[in-house]
Amino acid sequence: KIDACKRGDVTVKPSHVILLGSTVNITCSLKPRQGCFHYSRRNKLILYKFDRRINFHHGHSLNSQVTGLPLGTTLFVCKLACINSDEIQICGAEIFVGVAPEQPQNLSCIQKGEQGTVACTWERGRDTHLYTEYTLQLSGPKNLTWQKQCKDIYCDYLDFGINLTPESPESNFTAKVTAVNSLGSSSSLPSTFTFLDIVRPLPPWDIRIKFQKASVSRCTLYWRDEGLVLLNRLRYRPSNSRLWNMVNVTKAKGRHDLLDLKPFTEYEFQISSKLHLYKGSWSDWSESLRAQTPEEEPTGMLDVWYMKRHIDYSRQQISLFWKNLSVSEARGKILHYQVTLQELTGGKAMTQNITGHTSWTTVIPRTGNWAVAVSAANSKGSSLPTRINIMNLCEAGLLAPRQVSANSEGMDNILVTWQPPRKDPSAVQEYVVEWRELHPGGDTQVPLNWLRSRPYNVSALISENIKSYICYEIRVYALSGDQGGCSSILGNSKHKAPLSGPHINAITEEKGSILISWNSIPVQEQMGCLLHYRIYWKERDSNSQPQLCEIPYRVSQNSHPINSLQPRVTYVLWMTALTAAGESSHGNEREFCLQGKAN
């Protein structure tokens, strides 16, 4: 009931709590002398369902049969309406519509750790929409039953607050949950278990790792566990990996030797525990231990390449290049590279440690037979040295690969193809494809890239350090013993017409012809490999079509003669450049008048 109900009563039959779909009878009756003054026959009783009128009646009482009430709480209020006055509230009642509890399902209990307490969970089934009390019972040995009630609205979990002990680990315990509300009760099926079934150990703690003699091959993982733990599983992975290595161990007593760790690698380790081979559940994984394994001496050998440059009649410049070892080969932080240069006939040798670079340049005599050895060193030792004899890589013309081509292959890739050399192709031990950005003037500081290809291959896809709209000088070397042959080509991964034309910087007269000189187009404006230059000229005040001369592009060329100009005629000259994608805009215009005599 609600309100004070001084003027009358509202009664509900059969009950204030009803099963969904049931009918209720609501009666509103006035107490004596509580009707409308003077006109008791004019009493008008009105029944509201929440704020909506559902029935009315003149007299001292009103009966209403109500059906179809929804799940939950519905408020009914009875009011009295008299002539010339506001409605007066008489009384009200709440009706609770719900269902009997369903049988709780999937009752399961767990005790977290040997010192933890037993907690059970279950599925309540559909909402009853009524106050429902859950009672959890646990019966076990020693003729004892524990019982706890849950009065939360949505109760599907209870912690008994008791601790099962391992004195008799095989003793049976039985748990049961009972749900009760005004419309009925229902009990779960009993869940029977032993101590070993429900105790879930705490995750291991205090995890440590030790490397004996700072060696990755002598690695022991240590941890602490609860006293009754029989089984452990270990999982570990390099920190940058998503895949775990898994190891199961029995009676480990808090230690295990790991034999397959890689050196100089950060690993993540986790451990889980279990009390029994086939009973109970695994603990949560422990907190992660992260540790880096010690270094080991490098394995593998450096990939070394070189470039020779003529200086003068007696000297040559040797530039050595090498690639970093992979992480798995370096097996530590590379502290320096050791380069040894040796003259093979005289036995003279010089050794140098290089730090922070993967290249080295020196000047040596053009005479003698020279060899180099390069190795990488970390704190534990050095890799095996890579030895190469310095030779003239392009000396053997018969070893030169044939029909070299370079074609764009998607974004920032170039496919280089060739045919084996004419000389016995089976003599080729390997091909080396080398590429570097094309810089007029042959700048030796430009980074060099290379890859090695097996002798049966006749193509290679180059993608490392390839940028769009840049022209690369590509060489293919065929190596055989102490001989080498090479062929070269220009190539780009992407091209468009150059952004500007060459700048004519001088026009000079020589024996009745002229020599035009120009500045190279800046590399960033070439937009790929240049194929041709065009020189245009026409008489200054003429409307005639210009004449043109097309000359193939060569890296070092920046002048060209023209001998078809008439003397004492003023000409306007300009230049353009072409890539495979098209022609540039005009470069600057220059005027020139040939002074020589007419023929």
């Epitope: 076990g140 004892l144 706890k148 607050g161 008791i162 099962l164 002990t165």
Partner: nanobody, 129 residues
Framework: QVQLQESGGGLVQAGGSLRLSCAAS????????MAWFRQAPGTEREFVAG?????????FYDNSVMGRFTISRDSAKNTMWLQINNLKPEDTAVYYC?????????????????????WGQGTQVTVSS
């Protein structure tokens, strides 16, 4: 000084009901374990029912009384009750109230007399057939 005082015993016919009370004074036991034991003539004192004292109180019963006896307490009044329904002649005994100064969480310890630090004088319950 701590005192436990039982009351509510008496002579009842089989099938009848009784409500035993245990009033504690001298200290508050609302957060600690409390229990009822009984002792029939010529037998050892045996555990009947108890409250763990852990959060929300877990009740525990000897299986022989489960479903007929209900243990409860009012922490504010420092009082514990044992409601006994459907009494049987074998329920005839002196009923003792016991209190511990700690929470009992170990499953087996609740029925041991040594778990409890304070005891009442007892109240007689006699069931006639």
């Amino acid at each position: 000084q701590v005192q436990l005082q039982e009351s509510g015993g008496g002579l009842v016919q089989a099938g009848g009901s009784l409500r035993l009370s245990c009033a504690a004074s001298g200290r508050t036991f609302s957060n600690y374990a409390m229990a009822w034991f009984r002792q029939a003539p010529g037998t050892e004192r045996e555990f009947v029912a108890g409250l763990s004292g852990s959060g929300g109180d877990t009740a525990f019963y000897d299986n022989s009384v489960m479903g007929r006896f209900t243990i409860s307490r009012d922490s504010a009044k420092n009082t514990m009750w044992l409601q006994i329904n459907n009494l049987k002649p074998e329920d005839t005994a002196v009923y003792y109230c016991a209190a511990a100064t700690h929470v009992v969480v170990n499953y087996g310890l609740v029925r041991r007399r040594g778990t409890y630090d304070y005891w009442g004088q007892g109240t007689q319950v006699t069931v006639s057939s």
